[in-house]
Interface confidence: medium
């Protein structure tokens, strides 16, 4: 049929939760492409009716919520003008019984992310929640070892969980709750994280540092494509992600439709005791609505933004 | 000009103790890693231990073959270098080397490299 | 632990001659390799850093090149006080370690 095929990581999830997965792969999702996910070579595609348990919502596909008989390889297609391409994700689907004592507590499955704390230092913890517009997040509750965290050494802050003056203590089973809701209908999900503790000090403690954008503006003229690089400096061992957005929005989902700005794929270099990542913004075709807009790289707890502004007229051309 | 002198080598019995010391001088010492190299007679250059700079928390890593035996540190209102060798062998008989690192870190560029070698302090281990 | 592997081990070169040196990493050290020059009953110098950066006060004739696990020491027109023995040292991770050494002499 003429796909190229890709094969991404296996994803192990938990029964009875709201998951999704994304079919990006940029740069081929960075054009006018189109996306239709499949289950286990199948020739029908995955139903895009919102009430389905299993549908495809744009280009994700969410599940609402995981059954065990989910399990298999799922494909997503995309195809541009041009091209065809083919992921495979392998979904692993297992019982959770979070705090089932009984089984010990916290199973230890390679879903659960681990993160770790810098002792000493104020730090934190980040709820990893990926799912599609349509599905709305509440507030994120946080246990250890099945016990609601509360203490004033603790904040909920959006999707993370800042920790100050971090103990050995701290180490252990974690677990974020949320309550996602789709078309009235509410759902749980909960994330379990192994958390270590760890002396050493990476360059200026654990929070990554953004080399490029410096809160800035550029010059660009109207209609020109632009590319620019976000350049963070992190630990090895850190957990954040990299990002850009607009409008507190991930760019490729603030211009979902048009794919007129996109995230590119992000690459490292790997240094002796700390990592440079690169992940680049492209605008295809600046337009005036982008002028005066901050674009804000994101790396964990930093941030850094540019503004794009149009160039100065040169009055030598009159 | 950047200087580094190494002292505290001699003739020790296996399972005897010894303490190297190196002066530093012509650089800001709490901005530089520190190094100790060995050579053995006639053998290759051996990485022995590092420790960071300030910037890094002074944190320090041993090869295996020190590791629970040779303690690095620094005093730097000293810019000395020290390396305390516990329970010696004879396979640590060599010259031992202060080096600088010139590890530089502003948060983008790094260069790895061992920049300036003090000229060397022999440690014979023999009974 | 990454091991350095340097060959030769003797290269034997007249003078005015050109001279490659090899290193090889067991395993990916981007472009974390340096080189050194020891002379007889002398520390080692610094020669090349980051793979082809020459070091402060070193010839124009010496040039080094690679990335990843292969990496070469070039010297292009051999002078007599080049004669001696070259390390290469990978230092991506811990435990910073060097090749065996490759000792240049005079043919």
């Known amino acids: 049929d003429g796909c190229k095929d890709i094969f991404m990581k296996n994803e192990i999830l938990s029964a009875s939760q709201p998951f999704a997965f994304n079919c990006t792969f940029p740069p081929i999702t960075s054009g006018e492409v189109s996306v239709t996910w499949y289950k286990n070579s199948s020739k029908i595609p995955v139903s895009k009716i919102i009430q389905s348990r299993i549908h495809q919502d744009e280009t994700w596909i969410l599940f609402l919520p995981m059954e065990w008989g989910d399990s298999g390889v799922y494909q997503c297609v995309i195809k541009g003008r041009d091209s065809c391409h083919r992921i495979h994700v392998n979904l692993t689907v297992f019982e959770k019984h979070w705090c089932d004592t009984s089984i010990g507590g916290l199973p230890n499955l390679s879903d659960e992310y681990k993160q770790i704390l810098h002792l000493g230092k104020d730090d934190s913890l980040t709820c990893h929640l990926h799912f599609p517009k349509s599905c709305v997040l509440g507030p994120i509750k946080w246990y250890k070892d099945c016990n609601e965290i509360k203490g004033e050494r603790f904040t909920v802050l959006e999707t993370r969980l800042l920790v100050s003056n971090v103990s050995a203590e701290d180490r252990g089973n974690y677990a974020c709750q949320a309550i996602l809701t789709h078309s009235g209908k509410q759902y749980e999900v909960l994330n379990g994280i192994t958390v270590s503790i760890t002396e050493r000090a990476g360059y200026g403690g654990s929070v990554p540092k953004i080399i490029y954008p410096k809160n800035h503006s550029i010059e660009v003229q109207l209609g020109t494509t632009l590319i620019v690089d976000c350049n963070v400096t992190d630990t090895k061992d850190n957990t954040n992600l990299r990002c850009w957005r607009v409008n507190n929005t991930l760019v490729d989902d603030y211009y979902d439709e048009s794919k007129r700005i996109r995230e590119g794929v992000e690459t490292h270099v790997s240094f002796r005791e700390h990592n440079l990542y690169t992940v680049n913004i492209t605008f295809l075709e600046v337009k005036m609505e982008d002028y005066g807009l901050p674009f804000m790289c994101h790396a964990g707890v930093s941030t850094a933004y540019i503004i794009l502004q149009l160039p100065a007229p040169d009055f030598r051309a009159y | 000009q950047v200087q580094l002198q190494e002292s505290g080598g001699g003739l020790v019995k296996p399972g005897g103790s010894l303490r190297l010391s190196c002066a530093a001088s012509?650089?800001?010492?709490?901005?530089?890693?520190m190094n100790w190299i060995r050579q053995a007679p006639g053998k290759g250059l051996e990485w022995v231990s590092l420790?960071?700079?300030?910037?890094?928390?002074?944190?320090?890593y041993y090869a295996d073959s020190v590791k629970g035996r040779f303690t690095i540190s620094r005093d730097n209102a000293k810019s000395s270098l020290y390396l305390q060798m516990n329970s010696l062998r004879a396979e640590d008989t060599a010259v031992y080397y202060c080096?600088?690192?010139?590890?530089?870190?502003?948060?983008?560029?790094?260069?790895?490299?061992?920049?300036?070698w003090g000229q060397g302090t022999l440690v014979t281990v023999s009974s | 632990e990454i091991v350095m592997t340097q060959s030769p081990a003797t290269l034997s070169v007249s003078p005015g001659e050109r001279a490659t040196l090899s290193c090889r990493a067991s395993?990916?050290?981007?472009?974390?390799l340096s080189w050194y020059q020891q002379k007889p009953g002398q520390a080692p110098r610094l020669f090349i850093y980051?793979?082809?950066n020459l070091h402060t006060g070193v010839p124009a004739r010496f040039s080094g090149s690679g990335s990843g696990t292969e990496f070469t020491l070039t010297i292009s027109s051999l002078q007599s006080e080049d004669f001696a023995v070259y390390y290469c040292?990978?230092?991506?991770?811990?435990?910073?370690?060097f090749g065996q050494g490759t000792k240049l002499e005079i043919k």
């Open positions: 040292l990978q230092s991506q991770s811990y435990p910073l370690t």
């Open positions: 980051k793979a082809s």
């Open positions: 080096v600088r690192d010139m590890t530089i870190y502003d948060g983008y560029y790094v260069d790895y490299a061992l920049d300036y």
């Open positions: 012509g650089f800001a010492f709490t901005d530089y890693y």
């Open positions: 395993q990916n050290i981007n472009i974390w």
């Open positions: 420790i960071r700079n300030k910037a890094a928390g002074y944190t320090i």
